[in-house]
Interface confidence: low
């Protein structure tokens, strides 16, 4: 632990100004792990001059700086690039002059106290009076700065000509693809100072590459894949003083696939899984032994987990018997094509013939968490209709 | 279809000025970077530079930097070329082309081909 | 700046094989999940015409006897079958992020 700090695992406090520390507190090899340190305090340092690139680095865990009543003058561009954790930032009644919001904008900061700098009044420091007045709570910071008089001028009536927040303006077409086709997006941005214009795509999974002049860019996405429908894309405008997003959500349209389809499972009802994915939602119909079923209350589709476009369900069958075996077809469809699979479902043997008895279903309230979403009309003549599994069984349980 | 339409042949003296033309059709011209590269006789291709007509922002190969300036005239859908203090090594080729999805010159003008002699 | 140094400079081909031509980056030309390289061929007397934009996509026209492969730094353009009409200069050419962009030397093939 540096000479004017105590350490703790979790913590460093230097506040000693005898002798003081000249440089950001550094932990040396072998000592405590700086990754679980997630306190600094500062105090009383006259000499801490420079927070550079790499001195808080190895502190990812950091959540509360600290750094009063002492020297500080300047805080590198990159200082807290690894800190994502930090959340309390308190550099009160020190030397800076002027600070960058790059220091604090990829950080997710609930308190940021400046008071008690002597900041020059220009429009590096006009994203501070935005950021307060965006909090405009009742604590709000006291915060002043010198002019070209050496005057104390306070922030909150800062004014300076060609110095505001940008704006961003997406001009986005229908957002609704089909899979596999490619767009175009354009955005403008417009401020003083002119703002810096780039897309954030997030975890897009469709190829894509923009070009990007200062004030307008377009972004094209090549081959739109499913996996990529309800993603939001976003075009940022960003200056000195703070930022724009113009954003909008990507929609995509595509062929249904049925990706799962299981042998039934026996629970307080069997159950034939399946999942079924594709935009707009699909419409389930259920074939038995190559005729159309026929569902009912005893024998139904039940969407149990919606995903976006991926839907999680079951064929409910209560209680059936060796009447309800046989092959079991999914026909998923929208207007972009369909899909189907089959699988084969055995429920019991047929009687006389020793292959498991019926289940002894325990007395269990099922939970809908869905609706039968099989919305393909019945056309079929009914002589191949499965079996209705409406039966009492012996308890007088009617199932 | 999309097409780039440059101006003729130009025959011009050393120290001379000259502006190549390049007339775009068949797309927004404002919103597609527009490209130039010469190309010497029998030589290479050089890339010169790239203008946005949307709002003019340019970048240039320095070894081009105060030969050639990029303009363009959204009105007229045209993008222009002018190289200044013309010697006989500025003599070739020179091309037009547009930026197509990830920076590939997918369209180029027919060239217009620059002699700097006295 | 990026320099692209293409191989062979010139090179003769049967008539029904396989050219291939090579472009080396002297840095990584990747960027955004795409490798920023293009190859075109240029005839005499006429522009160059893109053939492969980033790295392996066709574009469209161009007939499915060219094709593209490589990513960072090492690239190739493989023409198979060759045919008459194929004999050309062939560039490669990077757009890498920030400009300047470059183009390699140029590969003449000749069909034998």
């Known amino acids: 632990c540096p000479t004017s700090c105590k350490c703790s695992a979790s913590r460093i406090w230097c506040s000693d100004p005898s002798p003081g520390i000249v440089a950001f507190p550094r932990l040396e090899p072998n000592s405590v792990d700086p990754e679980n340190i997630t306190e600094i305090f500062i105090a009383n340092q006259k000499r801490l001059e420079i927070i550079n690139e790499d001195d808080v680095e190895a502190y990812v865990g950091l959540r509360n700086l600290t750094i009063v009543d002492s020297g500080l003058k300047f805080v590198a561009h990159k200082a807290f690039l690894k800190n994502s954790n930090l959340q309390h930032i308190n550099f009160t009644r020190n030397k800076l002059t002027s600070l960058s919001r790059k220091h604090f904008r990829h950080l997710d900061l609930s308190e940021l106290i400046l008071v008690g700098n002597p900041f020059t009044c220009s429009c590096d420091i006009m994203w501070i009076k935005t950021l307060q007045e965006a909090k405009s709570s009742p604590d709000t910071q006291d915060l002043y700065c010198l002019n070209e008089s050496s005057k104390n001028i306070p922030l909150a009536n800062l004014q300076i000509p060609n110095c505001g927040l940008p704006s961003a303006n997406l001009a986005a077409p229908n957002l609704t693809v089909e899979e596999g086709k490619s767009i175009t997006l354009s955005c403008s941005v417009a401020g003083d100072p002119v703002p810096n214009m780039y897309w954030d795509v997030g975890n897009l999974v469709s190829k894509h590459m923009n070009e990007t002049s200062h004030t307008q860019g377009s972004l094209r996405i090549t081959n739109i894949s499913s996996d990529d429908s309800g993603k939001q894309i976003s075009c940022v405008a960003e200056n000195l003083v703070g930022e724009d997003q113009d954003s909008v959500n990507l929609t995509v349209h595509f062929a249904p696939t049925i990706t799962f389809l299981e042998s039934p499972t026996s629970d307080h009802h069997w159950c034939i899984p399946f999942t079924v994915k594709g935009n707009p939602k699909p419409a389930l119909q259920w074939f038995y032994n190559g005729a159309i079923l026929n569902e009912s209350k005893y024998i139904c589709t039940k969407i149990h987990v919606t995903n976006h476009t991926e839907y999680h369900g079951c064929l409910q069958l209560d209680n059936p018997t060796h009447m309800n075996n046989g092959d079991y077809t999914l026909i998923a469809k929208n207007e972009y094509g369909k899909d189907e699979k089959q699988i084969s479902a055995h429920f019991m043997g047929w009687p006389g013939i020793d292959d498991g008895a019926n289940p002894n279903y325990p007395d269990v309230i099922y939970e809908d968490y869905g609706t039968a979403a099989n919305d393909i009309g019945d056309t079929t003549n009914r002589s191949n209709e499965i079996p209705s599994t409406d039966v009492t069984d012996k308890t007088g349980r009617e199932h | 279809q999309v097409q780039l339409q440059q101006s003729g042949p130009e025959l011009v003296k050393p120290g001379a000025s000259v502006k190549i033309s390049c007339k775009a059709s068949g797309y927004t011209f404002s919103s597609s970077w527009m490209n130039w590269v010469k190309q010497r006789p029998g030589q290479g291709l050089e890339w010169i530079g790239r203008?946005?007509?949307?709002?003019?922002?340019?970048n240039y190969n320095g070894k081009f930097k105060g030969k050639a300036t990029l303009t363009a005239d959204k009105s007229s859908s045209t993008a222009y070329m002018q190289l200044t203090s013309l010697t006989s090594v500025d003599s070739g080729v020179y091309f037009c082309?547009?930026?197509?999805?990830?920076?590939?010159?997918?369209?180029w003008g027919q060239g217009t081909t620059l002699t700097v002699s006295s | 700046n990026i320099v692209l140094t293409q191989s062979p400079a010139s090179l003769a081909v049967s008539l029904g094989q396989r050219a291939t031509i090579s472009c080396r980056a002297s840095e990584s030309v990747d960027n955004y999940g795409n490798s920023l390289m293009h190859w075109y061929q240029q005839k005499p007397g006429q522009p160059p015409k893109l053939l492969i934009y980033l790295a392996s996509n066709l574009e469209s026209g161009v007939p499915a006897r060219f094709s593209g492969s490589g990513s960072r730094t090492d690239f190739t353009l493989t023409i198979d079958p060759v045919e008459a009409d194929d004999a050309a200069t062939y560039y490669c050419?990077?757009?890498?992020?920030?400009?300047?962009?470059?183009f390699g030397g140029g590969t003449k093939l000749e069909i034998k």
């Open positions: 203008i946005y007509p949307g709002d003019g922002h340019t």
């Open positions: 082309a547009r930026s197509g999805y990830g920076y590939g010159f997918d369209c």
């Open positions: 050419q990077q757009n890498n992020e920030d400009p300047p962009w470059t």
